[in-house]
């Protein structure tokens, strides 16, 4: 970087080399070159010579002034024009940065993905700081009062084996950079309440040729959690709004969900689950696409009243329309 060069003088920044974005700043350059009384002092930003807002302070020093500096990073260096030298002589260089102090971290969330062996904590860091910002995650046992701290630049994975202080913890996050420090509210967690079941996956679909063709979605999870609530959402790929259906699920067998779907339309499905009654959901599963078969022949009056509407239906992916839960309405 620019800071590794051999200097013949020095360069400094007021108020600091890291400063709040949008500030007015001054960059000073002082030459200390043997046998050189500089005729002129020049400033360069990212290799480009600056032509304005330069003031000569004395024989060896000049100032460059910037109003409302908005660049996150810049490399500055200055040079001197020395008598009897055909080219400018480098004085010194410095990297400068502008940014913001961190916002208060909020939406602190800690979850344990089933089988991961880790507690994953994330938070909303707020607006971009543009400068190096570190986060310290504090985990304090409510039973032993022991506190552990973890340094990170984004989220943190904490091995559940290291959580030896029982089941209840306080978690909070401190954010710090050169311009300031902020601390989140404390999140109280119980390890049993933050488990997210093993990912639910849509595996296949089939369409049954019936008076009203039904598409059956097959989906599963490797979870060992007994009581799981799931949502499946679906829509035509040309539409923006999703239909969402809810299920109480027992994953001791592959799930089958029925949809009534409009013909000749490409649909997309996703599923997600949570331990019933708990707070956190899985992320939505990867998109599963299916185009429904055509079932729109020109009908006669006879065909309309009977069941010759539907052309043969064979589907080997997935589709959507109406998902029906398994609550039966039969009498007897």
């Amino acid at each position: 970087g620019i800071t590794n060069i051999n200097c013949s003088g020095h360069i400094w920044v007021e108020p600091a080399t890291i400063f709040k974005m949008g500030m007015n700043i001054s960059i000073y350059c002082q030459a200390a070159i043997k046998n050189c009384q500089p005729r002129k002092l020049h400033f360069y930003k990212n290799g480009i010579k600056e032509r304005f807002q330069i003031t000569r302070i004395n024989k060896t020093t000049a100032r460059l002034w910037y109003k409302n500096f908005l660049e996150p990073h810049a490399s500055m260096y200055c040079t001197a024009e020395c008598p009897k030298h055909f080219q400018e002589t480098l004085i010194c260089g410095k990297d400068i940065s502008s940014g913001y102090p961190p916002d208060i971290p909020d939406e602190v969330t800690c979850v344990i993905y089933e089988y991961s062996g880790n507690m994953t904590c994330t938070w909303n860091a707020g607006k971009l700081t543009y400068i190096d910002t570190k986060y310290v995650v504090h985990v304090k046992s409510l039973e032993t009062e022991e506190e552990q701290q973890y340094l990170t630049s984004s989220y943190i994975n904490i091995s559940t084996d290291s959580l030896q202080g029982g089941k209840k913890y306080l978690v909070w996050v401190q954010a710090a950079n050169a311009l300031g420090m902020e601390e989140s509210k404390q999140l109280q967690i119980h390890l049993d309440d933050i488990v997210i079941p093993s990912a639910a996956v849509i595996s296949r679909a089939e369409t049954i040729n019936a008076t009203v063709p039904k598409t059956i979605i097959y989906w599963d999870s490797q979870t060992t959690i007994e009581k799981v609530s799931c949502e499946m959402r679906y829509k035509a790929t040309t539409n923006q709004t999703w239909n969402v259906k809810e299920f109480d699920t027992n994953f001791t067998y592959v799930q089958q969900s029925e949809f009534y779907l409009e013909p000749n339309i490409k649909y997309v499905f996703q599923v997600r689950c949570q331990e019933t009654g708990k707070r956190y959901w899985q992320p939505w599963s990867s998109l599963f696409f299916h185009k429904t078969p055509e079932t729109v022949p020109q009908v006669t009056s006879k065909a309309f009243q009977h069941d010759t509407w539907n052309s043969g239906l064979t589907v080997a992916s997935i589709s959507t329309g109406h998902l029906t839960s398994d609550n039966r309405g039969d009498i007897g």
Epitope: A210, T211, V212, K235, N239, E258, E262, T295, D307, G329
Partner: antibody, heavy 117, light 106 residues
Framework: EVQLQQSGPGLVKPSQSLSLTCSVT?????????WNWLRQFPGSKLEWMGF???????DYNPSLKNRISITRDTSKNQFFLRLNSVTTEDTATYYC??????????WGPGTTLTVSS | DIVMTQSPAIMSASLGEKVTMSCRAS?????MYWYQQKSDASPKLWIY???NLAPGVPARFSGSGSGNSYSLTISSMEGEDAATYYC?????????FGAGTKLELK
């Protein structure tokens, strides 16, 4: 040819439950299609309420989900609407209808229901 | 819920006149379905899958459209066409209807 006939009271008191029956002839409700209840309010607005399909599974309009139940008696080829905790807002003409993929191809004659004390 | 907006709410047409009514969905739908209802009668399926005429519907009727915007057209108005026409979508639950266009004979 499928035909749908409806029966049920014309007057129900507020907070009581409404029960309607749709009797289907010319087609077995277990053979296919889905069997719907819809209603039309005095201002002519139509609202789909829910269905029971040929397997006995239900789907309901979320606006009614906590109050509605659609069941069937396969031996009589009938399906039923029960709407709990009715208010004057539920005054409407209620229709049963056979559903296909997206639309309703056969409708019952309708039952006018008034909710009043 | 997808809101279906029909226009005009009421219209009148002379015998032989071409009639067009429209239905707009608040978000894109796959198909549109139309029903005809005469006073003191149940609605009847009239057009399904946007452009297919239900059995018994005269060929002077047609349906068209895509996305958010659909229409029902009568090429030449006849007296028996005076009725209220409702549009309906099945794309998103709950299935919803428009408020209707009442077509009167001038």
């Amino acid at each position: 040819e499928v035909q749908l006939q409806q029966s049920g009271p014309g007057l129900v008191k507020p907070s009581q439950s409404l029960s309607l029956t749709c009797s289907v002839t010319g087609y077995s409700i277990t053979s296919g299609y889905f069997w719907n209840w819809l209603r039309q309010f005095p201002g002519s607005k139509l609202e789909w309420m829910g269905f029971i399909d040929n397997d006995g599974s239900n789907d309901y309009n979320p606006s009614l989900k906590n109050r509605i139940s659609i069941t069937r008696d396969t031996s009589k080829n009938q399906f039923f609407l029960r709407l709990n905790s009715v208010t004057t807002e539920d005054t409407a003409t209620y229709y049963c209808a056979r559903g296909r993929l997206g639309f309703f191809d056969s409708w019952g004659p309708g039952t006018t229901l008034t909710v009043s004390s | 819920d997808i809101v279906m907006t029909q226009s005009p709410a009421i219209m009148s047409a002379s015998l032989g006149e071409k009639v067009t009514m429209s239905c707009r969905a608040s978000s894109s739908v796959n198909y549109m379905y139309w029903y005809q209802q005469k006073s003191d009668a149940s609605p009847k399926l009239w057009i399904y899958y946007t452009s297919n005429l239900a059995p018994g519907v005269p060929a002077r009727f047609s349906g068209s459209g895509s996305g958010n915007s659909y229409s029902l057209t009568i090429s030449s108005m006849e007296g028996e066409d005076a009725a209220t026409y409702y549009c309906q979508q099945f794309t998103n639950s709950p299935w919803t209807f428009g408020a209707g266009t009442k077509l009167e004979l001038k």
